[in-house]
Interface confidence: low
């Protein structure tokens, strides 16, 4: 599992919010969907 930068930005991609991450071979580890209170929960 790759670590994520806390200051990561995000973009909409295929109807999923995907956080920019370092050294992540797949977007799956960063798929979130909903961010509330600074915490990605879905």
């Amino acid at each position: 599992d790759a670590e994520f930068r806390h200051d990561s930005g995000y973009e909409v991609h295929h109807q999923k919010l995907v956080f920019f991450a370092e050294d992540v071979g797949s977007n799956k580890g960063a798929i979130i969907g909903l961010m509330v209170g600074g915490v990605v929960i879905a």
Epitope: E3, N27, I32, G33, V36, G37, V39, I41
Partner: antibody, heavy 125, light 106 residues
Framework: EVQLLESGGGLVQPGGSLRLSCAAS???????PMWWVRQAPGKGLEWVS?????????TYADSVKGRFTISRDNSKDTLYLQMNSLKAEDTAVYYC??????????????????WGQGTLVTVSS | SYELTQPPSVSVSPGQTASITCSGH??????TSWYQQKSGQSPVLVIY???KRPSGIPERFSASNSGHTATLTISGAQATDEADYYC?????????FGGGTKLTVL
């Protein structure tokens, strides 16, 4: 012991209101995203609403949008669900649940790892 | 909205292997979790992030997620495993549950 305890359910007439509470204990409630999930009699699970650590950040299922309001009081370690304009189809057991978070990897999805015992809401005349 | 489809029921003999499927469009692109709900009780998380077991969940519970289908496998099913099982995944802005599968251990 990590625990969630719901209260506030009961019998209410269509168009009425109820406020559900969920008291948390045994974990750091403040940063934890929290869910309300319901289950109609003999039916499956349906998410209702979710809230993050900031009470201004929440979302709702279309079926309850504009009628239900989720909130939390982190000083009391308590989650709430204000339900207005209740309908017969809102009859269900309502569960609160904690979103499991690995705080070292805050952008990961895990699941709802702690659930309350549920409180029954019956909407009937 | 995104939908997850499960068979309504699955039967298994004690000691045998039970497989419960959960289907959704390009499901492998999403993380899937599984919940066990015994009669009259609250749901319990048994699998998260496709194939990981929370502490306290027996090793006989395993899962996979490939293509359009996630599968929960219970190896050496026991009478205590009789329950409803729900798959769950993320939708665009929230969480979605499958309709549930009733596992009967005959």
């Amino acid at each position: 012991e990590v625990q969630l305890l719901e209260s506030g359910g009961g019998l209410v007439q269509p168009g009425g209101s109820l406020r559900l509470s969920c008291a948390a204990s045994g974990f750091d409630f403040g940063p934890s995203p929290m869910w309300w999930v319901r289950q109609a009699p003999g039916k499956g699970l349906e998410w209702v609403s979710v809230i993050g650590k900031d009470t201004q950040n929440s979302t709702y299922a279309d079926s309850v949008k504009g009628r239900f309001t989720i909130s939390r009081d982190n000083s009391k370690d308590t989650l709430y669900l204000q339900m207005n304009s209740l309908k017969a189809e809102d009859t269900a057991v309502y569960y609160c649940a904690r979103e499991w978070m690995d705080h070292s990897r805050p952008y990961y999805y895990y699941g709802m790892d702690v659930w309350g015992q549920g409180t029954l809401v019956t909407v009937s005349s | 909205s995104y939908e997850l489809t499960q068979p309504p029921s699955v039967s298994v003999s004690p000691g045998q292997t039970a497989s419960i499927t959960c289907s959704g469009h390009n499901l492998e692109d999403k993380f899937t979790s599984w919940y066990q709900q015994k009669s009259g009780q609250s749901p319990v998380l048994v699998i998260y992030r496709d194939d990981k077991r929370p502490s306290g969940i027996p090793e006989r519970f395993s899962a996979s997620n490939s293509g359009h289908t996630a599968t929960l496998t219970i190896s050496g099913a026991q009478a205590t495993d009789e329950a409803d099982y729900y798959c769950s995944s993320q939708d665009t802005v929230t969480r979605v549950f499958g309709g549930g599968t009733k596992l009967t251990v005959l």
